[in-house]
């Protein structure tokens, strides 16, 4: 009778290749009823949480994590996970953020539009049946910035 939580998806706006100093917004999506979305870096101990969750559609909720001014330190893989009490979902696939030196402006044509990583059919390597992220780490507000207060 255990109800499985669908894996979240992650996307980036305006894309995954971002000029230095420009902004990027990661969008995490999951089912309705999500309380907390977590955006993780490659290490699960570096993350940012938000409860600024909106309904994207009748069956889907989303949260947005914005980086106002991208630096080289922001490059790398990101993924989403969510908390629908009392459980945590599995993680989304990774989405790789690339930061490029500015040759053109923020609207440079080689900025990839709306890349995303959605759920796949392969099982995740950590089952989360205890539905808790393994990390004991602290949130890294210095890495991500979004409009929800901590």
């Amino acid at each position: 009778q255990e109800e499985d939580l669908p894996r979240p998806s992650i996307s980036a706006e305006p894309g995954t290749v971002i000029p230095l100093g420009s902004h990027v917004t990661f969008v995490c999506r999951g089912p309705v009823g999500v309380q907390t979305f977590r955006l993780e870096r490659e290490s699960r101990s570096t993350y940012n949480d938000t409860e600024d969750v909106s309904q994207a559609s009748p069956s889907e909720s989303e949260a947005r994590f914005r980086i106002d001014s991208v630096s080289e330190g922001n490059a790398g893989p990101y993924r989403c996970i969510y908390y629908k009490p009392p459980k945590w979902s599995e993680q989304s696939d990774y989405l790789e953020l690339l930061v490029k030196e500015t040759s053109g402006g923020p609207d440079s044509p080689d900025t990839e539009p709306g890349s995303s990583a959605g759920p796949t059919q392969r099982p995740s390597d950590n089952s989360h049946n205890e539905h808790a992220p393994a990390s004991q780490g602290l949130k890294a507000e210095h890495l991500y910035h979004h409009h929800h207060h901590h």
């Epitope: 009823g33 309380q35 907390t36 409860e51 908390y83 009490p85 992220p133 901590h150």
Partner: antibody
Framework: EQSLKESGGRLVTPGGSLTLTCTAS????????IQWVRQAPGKGLEWIGF??????EYSATWAKGRFTIYKTSSTTVELKMTSLTASDTATYFC??????WGPGTLVTISS | ELVMTQTESPVSAAVGGTVTISCQSS???????LSWFQQKPGQPPKELVY???TLQSGVPSRFSGSGSGTQFTLTISDLECDDAATYYC??????????FGGGTEVEIK
């Protein structure tokens, strides 16, 4: 073994303040809602509020202003109560949303 | 004001029988956030059911939850003496607000 335990309950005079502590073992509270609930002697359960993984506090309308919930470490959450009256006499429980509960700690408000 | 109204106490049934406890909310709960708890004297509550109908780990299948919106039910079948307790519903609402029902005492004859 994952568990919770409340501490700090005692006799307090009306108008006084008290801080209760919920200590977690075996898990990181930054990954869960940590709820506070109270139960007056012989009465039902009453939700007070909780602190979320993001560190946000949510509480019952009646508790706002007098009751404050905050994290003090990755294993402890505190409930600060002020302007206490006899009607606040109860056993106070903390819970990990809602699958694991502490045994409770008794708070008595009396002169 | 958010109110959860439960079946009045006590509810009595014989060993092997079935008990149904209802819980009515003054507003729709958010996304099936409805739990049922069992509490015995001197003990903390124990969660039986969450998300309206999902059994908590280790809870016997004699317990079942159902409902939606504002009307919810906990059914206990094949009653055992150990089921004598007070049962509470808990609704979760938009804005991360929770409200307990008043409790229903179950007696086993």
């Amino acid at each position: 073994e994952q568990s919770l335990k409340e501490s700090g309950g005692r006799l307090v005079t009306p108008g006084g303040s008290l801080t209760l502590t919920c200590t977690a073992s075996g898990f990181d509270i930054n990954n869960y809602n940590i709820q506070w609930v109270r139960q007056a002697p012989g009465k039902g359960l009453e939700w007070i509020g909780f602190i979320s993984p993001a560190g946000n506090e949510y509480s019952a309308t009646w508790a706002k202003g007098r009751f404050t919930i905050y994290k003090t470490s990755s294993t402890t959450v505190e409930l600060k109560m002020t302007s206490l009256t006899a009607s606040d006499t109860a056993t106070y429980f903390c819970a990990r949303h809602w699958d694991s509960w502490g045994p409770g700690t008794l708070v008595t408000i009396s002169s | 004001e958010l109110v959860m109204t439960q079946t009045e106490s006590p509810v009595s049934a014989a060993v092997g029988g079935t008990v149904t406890i209802s819980c009515q909310s003054s507003q729709s709960v958010y996304s099936n956030r409805l739990s049922w708890f069992q509490q015995k004297p001197g003990q903390p509550p124990k969660e039986l059911v969450y998300w309206t109908s999902t059994l908590q780990s280790g809870v016997p299948s004699r317990f079942s939850g159902s409902g939606s919106g504002t009307q919810f039910t906990l059914t206990i079948s094949d009653l055992e003496c150990d089921d004598a307790a007070t049962y509470y519903c808990l609704g979760g609402y938009s804005g991360n607000i929770y409200v307990f029902g008043g409790g229903t005492e179950v007696e086993i004859k």
